[in-house]
């Protein structure tokens, strides 16, 4: 998802020394940045998130604050301090004229400044059915555990709190921080001020229509009547519940925020802090029919994000948009008339559609998996959700083009049974933003925090790049995609894994001077090869060498084209059993594909050769997929021979750890 | 712990009015509405209404439709139920329960409608 | 709507089990049913919620692991093991049905359960 590629406006306000020495330079002289939203009529000016820097204090917060207004004063100006944060970002929220953006920006402590901008709520019975495994009757619905165990805090409107789908699950904090509605004339009627929080509180835990109806939930008044918030407003409520973590530890948490606003920085940035807290955040793709990384807090990577199906499994259409989609996608769920709690009266249903509703959805799924696993960790989650939604059932056609390949084909699904999925080697694909057109343009793919990249692949429509490696960064191997020279840009895509007690490590072979082509092999006694990724320095790769096919019998190791550098991913886990699996097409063809078997997992993806005619390779789910220019294009027919390389492992530690407790 | 106390008993003549309380404690009283169900002399419960503590919305069995009014105060976190055009058949112990869960229960108030 | 029918009476001796039956009209077997324990004298208490799958939520507060629920088809059980004392009393099943304005809870008649 997201990181900080985010397309959203950044302005840098240069720092003039000649300042009346008021404010101290920031240390380094480094410069603080202002962003704002994108979107025109979502922002708030006025209204600024002055975020300091990490390791800052509560009591330096206050003083930055201080002498902001102190500063602003003798300029004559009146400023407000709305809040002061800390327990989840350190900074202050302020009400001030934009002219003191420069002053603000050189504060001591300053990281960043964000304008306050708009959030929106993301809202317009096959729902049970669909995430039911087949061995349920959805007229019966009884899931396995109701997720007694965990706690769901949804961040929304007001509720109906006594509804009968909802009474005594869900506690009413006293937590509300809202905008004004808009209009002279709005006039609060309570059940339309109730409508969206009631719906998906009923679709979380309602006792008839919910997803988890064991869970008991809390709910944070972030959205008024009219279903709008503030990034401000949401990032109080985030802290809020960090706070209340902090005072009173209960078992796992899922926050559900079934809202989005433009993307934003500062939005993110506090999900990530609460995310590694262990607090599992699930949110709205967006009903924007739009990329979803240009929204928040859908674009946060820690974020489990939902697109809308509707119950043909096809991407919800609302009214001239529908739900979002992209890369920034985790899965997507039920979101289309999806019946729930009405606020009308205390024993009413209504049907309501959105990506709010499928959030909802895998709130509630979130919720039964943590209630039968409590120790189950956001990345264990994260690939149990992908692991057992429903595979390749979206028409990709819906989505634009461009966005087919980066959107996860995934419907959201209740494990057949919410214990014994232990043994099973989870792997995900996580595709980069795109580099761009420059010649030196890069894209980088990154993995959780407690996943390893097994491997890493490119892609590049054009079929013009310079490959892949991984490499180090911040102690962490991440997956770097060259472009190149005329080149539209290139994607990286890491496949990351869940595996407990990994040592991996990359090695690395140059490009070889005969040839014979390039080869690189794990050499550390108990290392296994994961996955083979191929970097070039040159423009073209030759497109008449012929493709370099692997020796038989030596399984670890990694061949290339004779100019490419060749990077083997190495890695060492109890039980690891790694093997390659090769598809080869003599004929030109398009696409290229090989799986793996049942009870093995697709780790590595790679094309051979690497020549320029391949556009990339990349994994969807356990099948290795390997993209080459259109036919009617490529010449000769050896040239046009691919091969599609997959490495499929599999953990007999984990298969027997799993066991031994059956 | 959870409690709902009723009001006393009450004598009332046939055409009169009876306004039963129900104040409740250990909860947080907006987060269940009040049912309101009844039991005539060596009969079976009857159930007549409900109402919402959090925006005072009412639903009424129809047999005692346009004769009763359900109430709440949640200043107090107490509920009321009034009871117009008393019949000799109204005659029963009032119940006063949380929720449509109706978890716990008053300890009813007996009205005695009586020429 | 459901209706629900229960025995006049039951009766089972110390220390012995007994089960009780409510049973639901035709076309809602799959309605949840809540049954209630009315010592003599006093206010009905929430035993617990039952449905085909058996309970539903929690149990009432105070109710002893002696008290379970079942459910098939029309049929919605509860049975008492180690029959106590103070275990002699009526027991009413009710379900809710409907929703909006149509929404009514139905009770059955109540069984009288004596104690030998």
């Known amino acids: 998802q997201e990181d900080e590629d985010g397309d959203y406006e950044e302005l840098v306000l240069a720092l003039r020394s000649e300042e009346d020495g008021l404010a101290e330079a920031p240390e380094h002289g480094t410069t603080a940045t202002f962003h704002r939203c994108a979107k025109d009529p979502w922002r708030l000016p006025g209204t600024y998130v002055v975020v300091l820097k990490e390791e800052t204090h509560l009591s330096q917060s206050e003083r930055t604050a201080r002498r902001l207004q102190a500063q602003a004063a003798r300029r004559g100006y009146l400023t407000k301090i709305l809040h002061v944060f800390h327990g989840l970002l350190p900074g202050f929220l302020v009400k001030m004229s934009g002219d003191l953006l420069e002053l603000a920006l050189k504060l001591p402590h300053v990281d960043y400044i964000e304008e306050d901008s708009s959030v929106f709520a993301q809202s317009i019975p096959w729902n049970l059915e669909r995430i039911t495994p087949p061995r349920y009757r959805a007229d019966e619905y009884q899931p396995p555990d109701g997720g007694s165990l965990v706690e769901v805090y949804l961040l929304d409107t007001s509720i109906q709190s006594d509804h009968r789908e909802i009474e005594g699950r869900v506690m009413v904090t006293d937590f509300e921080n809202v905008p004004e509605e808009d209009g002279t004339r709005f006039h609060r009627q309570a059940s339309k001020c109730d409508s969206h929080g009631t719906h998906l509180a009923g679709v979380v835990s309602g006792r008839d229509a919910g997803v988890a109806k064991g869970a008991s939930m809390r709910s944070l008044r972030v959205l008024n009547c009219q279903g709008k918030g503030t990034v401000s407003g949401t990032l109080i409520g985030l802290e809020f519940i960090r706070k209340s973590q902090l005072v009173q530890p209960v078992g796992p948490l899922v926050v559900l925020l079934p809202l989005a606003g433009g993307y934003s920085r500062v939005l993110n940035a506090a999900c990530q802090r609460l995310a590694r807290a262990g607090v599992v955040l699930v949110t709205a793709a967006g009903n924007f029919r739009d990329d979803a990384c240009l929204y928040s807090p859908a674009s946060a990577p820690e974020v489990i994000t939902v697109g809308a199906t509707n119950a043909q499994d096809q991407p919800v259409t609302l009214g001239t948009l529908g739900t979002n989609f992209g890369r920034c996608v985790d899965l997507f769920a039920p979101g289309e008339d999806i019946i729930g709690a009405s606020s009308d009266c205390s024993t009413c249903f209504v049907s309501q559609s959105g990506t709010s509703q499928a959030a909802a959805h895998v709130a509630g799924i979130a919720a039964m998996m943590l209630s039968a696993e409590p120790e189950l960790t956001l990345a264990e989650l994260r690939q149990r959700l992908i692991h057992f939604s429903a595979k390749d059932v979206i028409n990709e056609a819906w989505f634009p083009e461009d966005q087919r390949v980066l959107t996860p084909n995934l419907v959201a699904a209740l494990p057949p049974s919410t214990h014994g999925a232990g043994w099973q080697l989870f792997c995900r694909t996580v595709w980069s933003a795109h580099s761009g057109p420059t010649r030196m343009a890069t894209a980088v793919a990154r993995c959780a925090p407690d996943e390893e990249l097994l491997s890493c692949s490119s892609f590049s429509r054009s079929g013009k790049r310079r490959g892949e490696r991984m490499e180090a960064q911040g102690g962490k191997l991440v997956c770097r995609a060259h472009n190149a020279f005329g080149g539209e840009g290139v994607y990286a895509i890491a496949r990351c894994c869940l595996l407990p007690q990994a040592n991996c490590s990359v090695h690395t072979a140059p490009p070889a001077e005969a040839s014979m082509g390039t080869r690189v092999h794990c050499h550390q006694q108990g290392h296994v090869l994961t996955g083979c990724s191929s970097h070039w320095e040159v423009e073209d790769l030759g497109t008449h060498k012929p493709p370099v096919l692997r020796p038989r019998g030596q399984p670890n190791q990694c061949v290339g084209h004779r100019e490419a550098s060749i990077h083997a991913s190495c890695c060492h886990a109890p039980g690891l059993e790694c093997k390659v699996k090769e598809h080869g097409i003599p004929a030109p063809q398009e696409q290229v594909t090989v799986a793996c078997e049942e009870g093995w997992t697709l780790t590595g993806c790679s094309a051979l050769p690497g020549t320029s005619h391949v556009l990339g390779a990349y994994a969807v789910d356990n099948t290795c997929v390997v993209r080459s220019r259109d036919v009617s294009t490529t010449g000769s027919t050896s040239e046009g021979a691919v091969t599609a390389v997959a490495i499929c492992c599999r953990s007999r530690h984990l298969a027997q750890a799993s066991q031994e407790l059956q | 712990q959870v409690q709902l106390v009723q009001s006393g008993a009450e004598v009332k003549k046939p055409g009169a009015s009876v306004k039963v309380s129900c104040k409740a404690s250990?909860?947080?009283?907006?987060?269940?509405?009040i049912s309101w169900v009844r039991q005539a002399p060596g009969q079976g419960l009857e159930w007549m209404g409900w109402i919402s503590t959090y925006n005072g919305n009412t639903n009424y069995a129809q047999k005692v439709q346009g004769r009763v009014t359900m109430t709440t105060d949640t200043s107090t976190s107490t509920a009321y139920m009034e009871l117009r055009s008393l019949r000799s058949d109204d005659t029963a112990v009032y119940y006063c329960?949380?929720?449509?869960?109706?978890?716990?229960w008053g300890q009813g108030t007996l009205v005695t409608v009586s020429s | 709507q459901p209706v629900l029918t229960q025995p006049l009476f039951a009766s089972a001796s110390l220390g012995a089990s007994v089960t009780l039956t409510c049973t639901l009209s035709?076309?809602?077997?799959?309605?949840?049913v809540d049954w209630y324990q009315q010592r003599p004298g006093k206010g009905p208490r929430f035993v617990m919620r039952v449905d085909t799958g058996g309970i539903v939520g929690s149990k009432g507060e105070g109710i002893p692991d002696r008290f379970s629920v079942l459910g098939s088809g029309l049929n919605r059980y509860l049975t008492i093991k180690n029959i106590q004392e103070e275990d002699e009393s009526d027991y009413h099943c009710g379900a809710d049905h409907g929703s909006g304005t149509n929404f009514v809870v139905v009770f059955g008649g109540g069984t009288k359960l004596t104690v030998l």
């Open positions: 250990g909860y947080t009283f907006t987060s269940y509405g």
């Open positions: 329960a949380r929720g449509y869960t109706r978890d716990y």
């Open positions: 035709s076309g809602y077997s799959s309605y949840e």
